[in-house]
Amino acid sequence: APVPPGEDSKDVAAPHRQPLTSSERIDKQIRYILDGISALRKETCNKSNMCESSKEALAENNLNLPKMAEKDGCFQSGFNEETCLVKIITGLLEFEVYLEYLQNRFESSEEQARAVQMSTKVLIQFLQKKAKNLDAITTPDPTTNASLLTKLQAQNQWLQDMTTHLILRSFKEFLQSSLRALRQM
């Protein structure tokens, strides 16, 4: 399994290195998760031809995956640090049920899927410390999440492959947009 950020051999070999700032830690954590997603996507793409499908074709799905929009304040036009941070945290909380769904979807990358899930939980904690307006963050309803998970798991094999691919791609895009915005904060 991949080693969580801050625990690799380079860090051990350099004990006198300056401790990471909160922003650096978040940056490193997101890059670590992106590496994990990359590994999971490799397995998914080797197993099915979903990765060849056009973005337009894949957009025709009824998954309500979090996505950045202009109104969220994470793009240059209308950039708003607080609004954007709330969107990032809310989006990550919404992704958690989909990351749970991924847990039994991988054979050779089982540990990697778990690492992505656990690292995301840590990332949410880091970001919550950074946010001033925690009241604006809505937590998904556990009952709704449970029924969504049941519904996703009841799909046929092809739809499950498609769902796995879409979750990974959307999560990657959400993290990229989030980190682009966080680097401006």
Partner: nanobody, 124 residues
Framework: EVQLVESGGGLVQPGGSLKLSCTTS????????VGWFRQAPGKEREFVAD????????WYAESVLGRFTISRDDAKNTVYLEMDGLKPEDTAVYYC?????????????????WGQGTQVTVSS
């Protein structure tokens, strides 16, 4: 790492336009974020603009906002920087840089591959 090659620089009069290109032969270039930086003689290298893996996510330095446009053509493995309303203070060597995470940003440390640069001179 990817090998990056910039082109399109040259001498142009104030108010004129240029279109810079940043190309690579790397086949996964569509997954990289690409940034443009510039360095004027005796000055620090500074951020100009960048584009994420998702082409609708762009960012510009205040000094070029509204005058420069960054775009990408993944079929051609190329990122462009269209520069309009050029001013003498835009004179510099322009470098493109790539970030394998598809994120980019306004600091040089976010990028892992760099081109050799192309000279842009704005003068009458």
């Amino acid at each position: 790492e990817v090998q990056l090659v910039e082109s399109g620089g040259g001498l142009v009069q104030p108010g004129g336009s240029l279109k810079l290109s940043c190309t690579t032969s790397g086949r996964r270039f569509s997954e990289y974020a690409v940034g443009w930086f510039r360095q004027a003689p005796g000055k620090e290298r500074e951020f100009v603009a960048d584009i994420g893996e998702q082409a609708d996510n762009t960012w510009y330095a205040e000094s070029v906002l509204g005058r420069f446009t960054i775009s990408r053509d993944d079929a051609k493995n190329t990122v462009y920087l269209e520069m309009d309303g050029l001013k003498p203070e835009d004179t510099a060597v322009y470098y493109c840089a790539a970030d394998k995470y598809g994120v980019g940003g306004n600091a040089q440390g976010y990028y892992d591959s760099w081109g050799q640069g192309t000279q842009v001179t704005v003068s009458s």
